[in-house]
């Protein structure tokens, strides 16, 4: 039985230009994490393997960094950016979890970071 | 030890079949994304196809030439990668080699010792 | 299809700075890599990602990838870098290999 719940860092804003750290967390469970994949409307941005390391997608290697953690870095962003992204863990014996994050990349300097939120 | 080591080539009628294998041992295979590439006498490497780790869907991607005809997958459990070949053509005569993809620093670029595939009436 | 160019042949002096182009639309929008290979042998993997050197691989080699050309260097070219160069253009839905470069040590 799936006991985790994945908590992130839920809506988000960004200016253009700018960076912003996508995370989540795996909590309520005592599975072990062995893969997470972070992905942005089925194109896979980077992988995050807990015995082989990480791998950033080629089309991403430019603007995007590893961490902090399990988390990735977006940077040198676009209104192109916008859109949801999802942390998929791969977890023992649990099975998958997958977060949701959604990015708005505002032209303004007014850009807010949104409330967390928990996906079960 | 770290290795792949390929089996199953042979000589094989035009419209035939073969199966080739791929015996993984020394690293975490399951992860991996793995890919057969082949060389035909004389001439340079052709991507064949390949198959993503199940945690990252394991799908398959192909070359055209081969696409329809042949197909990969894996057996983690088994450590091993295949390669069916069907209705095969004079033209896939080559050596098959496996190779993982280079997806992580710590697991790139290995290569076995290929395997040669003659296809002759 | 997506298709990769190198020059055929090339030589070098020892001692001299090799630099072997690949060249394929877009290509800095994937990862560039090269292997090399002797008569007879495996392919061996020389360079990943673009500008990675696997462990074991001399320093003399390293690449670059930018734009829609890769390179491969090799500086202080010696007598046992005679050999076929392959670039490989590499991402999550592809991979291509360059027709391979011939590189006479003279």
């Known amino acids: 039985m799936m006991t985790g719940t994945i908590e992130t860092t839920g809506n988000i804003s960004a200016e253009k230009g700018g960076s912003i750290i996508l995370q989540c967390h795996l909590s309520s469970t005592t599975a072990q994490v062995t893969q997470v994949n972070w992905e942005q409307q089925d194109q896979l941005l980077a992988i995050c393997n807990a015995d082989l390391g990480w791998h950033i997608s080629p089309s991403f290697k430019d603007r995007v960094a590893p961490g902090p953690g399990l988390g990735l870095t977006l940077q040198s962003l676009t209104v192109n950016d916008t859109g949801e992204y999802f942390c998929i863990y791969h977890t023992y014996p649990d099975g998958t979890y997958t977060g949701r994050i959604f990015l708005e990349v505002l032209e303004s300097s007014v850009a807010e970071h949104g409330a967390r939120f928990q996906i079960p | 030890e770290v290795q792949l080591v390929e089996s199953g080539g042979g000589l094989v009628k035009p419209g035939g079949s073969l199966r080739l294998s791929c015996a993984a041992s020394g690293f975490t295979f399951s992860y991996a994304w793995m890919s057969w590439v082949r060389q035909a006498p004389g001439k340079g490497l052709e991507w064949v196809g390949r198959?993503?780790?199940?945690?990252?869907?394991?799908?398959?991607d192909y070359a055209a030439p081969v696409k329809g005809r042949f197909t990969i997958s894996r057996d983690d459990s088994k450590n091993t990668l295949y390669l069916q070949m069907n209705s095969l053509k004079t033209e896939d005569t080559a050596v098959y080699y496996c190779?993982?993809?280079?997806?992580?620093?710590?697991?790139?670029?290995?290569w076995g010792q290929g395997t040669l595939v003659t296809v002759s009436s | 299809s997506y298709e990769l160019t190198q020059p055929p042949s090339m030589s070098v002096s020892p001692g001299q700075t090799a630099s072997i182009t690949c060249s394929g639309d877009k290509l800095g929008d994937k990862y560039a890599c090269w292997y090399q290979q002797k008569p007879g042998q495996s392919p061996v993997l020389v360079i990943y990602?673009?500008?990675k050197r696997p462990s074991g691989i001399p320093e003399r080699f390293s690449g670059s990838n930018s734009g829609n050309t890769a390179t491969l260097t090799i500086s202080g070219t010696q007598a046992m870098d005679e050999s076929d160069y392959y670039c490989q253009a590499w991402d999550s839905s592809t991979v291509v290999f360059g027709g391979g470069t011939k590189l006479t040590v003279l």
């Open positions: 190779t993982t993809d280079p997806l992580y620093d710590i697991l790139t670029g290995l």
């Open positions: 990602q673009d500008s």
């Open positions: 198959i993503k780790s199940k945690t990252n869907g394991g799908t398959t």
